[in-house]
Interface confidence: low
């Protein structure tokens, strides 16, 4: 049997909406022939399924085999090192992978200007892997919220923050002109999920966008 192979030091999930990636750290002093075996356990079906016999990477996309994550009690994953006929003990994820572990994102943010207001529309994520009925708004059907960060350019990079409860929002510019840049971070008030800030979207506001009223 030779020397024992050490186990991967840690195994964890990093997930966004229908983008579920398992990561692990490599064993020390691995050889060119070292690879990793990945197995998955679904809560309620107490048996491990082998997913990959020999992955020579440090991550594995488990989205396709965890599509029911949002309707299940969750999963655990485990990884072990394999080198020829030798293999290590398994390292198991130390938390249950459930909907609570999914980092919330938005698809995009669209901005337009109307009468001195910036009108924003948050597009929700539409991942290709998601089953047709599993939309973001059907899974997170209540208490969706969005933190809005607004930056004025030119300016001293100070942010204004605002929380909204809808995918449509409006920002009053107080008659200021210039470039306004907006980022959005989603959350669900009834849940503990982390949110990820969106890409910054910018729009220029000039005098022509203001209507003169008496």
């Amino acid at each position: 049997h030779g020397t024992e192979l050490p186990s991967p030091p840690s195994v964890w999930f990093e997930a966004e909406f229908f983008h579920h990636i398992l990561h692990w750290t490599p064993i020390p002093n691995q050889s060119e022939s070292t690879c990793y075996e990945v197995a998955l356990l679904r809560y309620g079906i107490e048996s491990w399924n082998s997913i990959s016999n020999c992955s020579q990477t440090l991550s594995y996309d488990l989205t396709a085999v965890t599509l029911d994550l949002y309707h299940s009690n969750g999963y655990r994953a485990r990884v072990r090192a394999v080198d020829g006929s030798r293999h290590s003990n398994w390292t198991v994820t130390n938390t249950r992978f459930s909907v609570d572990e999914v980092t919330l994102t938005v698809g995009s943010v669209n901005l337009e200007i109307h009468n001195g207001f910036i009108l924003g529309k948050i597009q929700l994520p539409r991942p290709k892997m998601a089953p047709a009925n599993d939309t973001y708004e059907s899974i997170f059907s209540h208490f969706r919220e969005y933190e809005i960060a607004i930056r004025k350019v030119p300016g001293n990079f100070t942010f204004t923050h605002k929380k909204v409860k809808h995918e449509n929002f409006s920002l009053l510019t107080s008659g200021e002109v210039g470039e306004f840049c907006v980022q959005v971070k989603p959350s669900v008030a009834s849940r503990s999920n982390k949110g990820m800030w969106s890409k910054e979207e910018c729009i220029s506001l000039t005098r022509q966008y203001f209507t003169v009223t008496n």
């Epitope: 990093e14 990636i21 990561h23 490599p26 691995q30 060119e32 020579q56 990477t57 440090l58 991550s59 996309d61 980092t103 982390k194 949110g195 990820m196 800030w197 969106s198 890409k199």
Partner: nanobody, 125 residues
Framework: QVQLQESGGGSIQAGGSLRLSCVAS????????MAWFRQSPGKEREAVAA????????LYSDSNKGRFTISQDNAKMTVYLQMNSLKSEDTAMYYC??????????????????WGQGTQVTVSS
């Protein structure tokens, strides 16, 4: 053991093309996203393009969409950046990055854990 090595930079006339390569060590390739960033003197490092190596899905920063193409060769564990119609403002040091940190914005330099040493691209008009 974990490393990224860029190559393919050089000096070129405006309007020309270059192809940059980033070779990853075996245990870094296919880990989540790999990306190209660039940095010109006195400016912040900015994203150019990224690829999700498990599926080949690509993303581009708006400023370079159309002129730059990111691609991969799984057998060679290499990510490429094809740059066409180069302009003088493309002059910069180009860096390859890998392993995006969780919960981070993909096109932020702080989001990536591993970086190459960079390859210089100089475009003269």
């Amino acid at each position: 053991q974990v490393q990224l090595q860029e190559s393919g930079g050089g000096s070129i006339q405006a309007g020309g093309s270059l192809r940059l390569s980033c070779v990853a060590s075996k245990y870094l390739y296919s880990t989540n996203y790999m990306a190209w960033f660039r940095q010109s003197p006195g400016k912040e490092r900015e994203a150019v393009a990224a690829i999700y190596t498990a599926s080949g899905a690509t993303l581009y920063s708006d400023s370079n969409k159309g002129r730059f193409t990111i691609s991969q060769d799984n057998a060679k564990m290499t990510v490429y950046l094809q740059m066409n119609s180069l302009k003088s403002e493309d002059t910069a040091m180009y860096y390859c990055a890998a392993v995006r940190k969780t919960g981070s914005y993909l096109f932020d330099a702080q989001s990536f854990t591993y970086w190459g040493q960079g390859t210089q691209v100089t475009v003269s008009s």
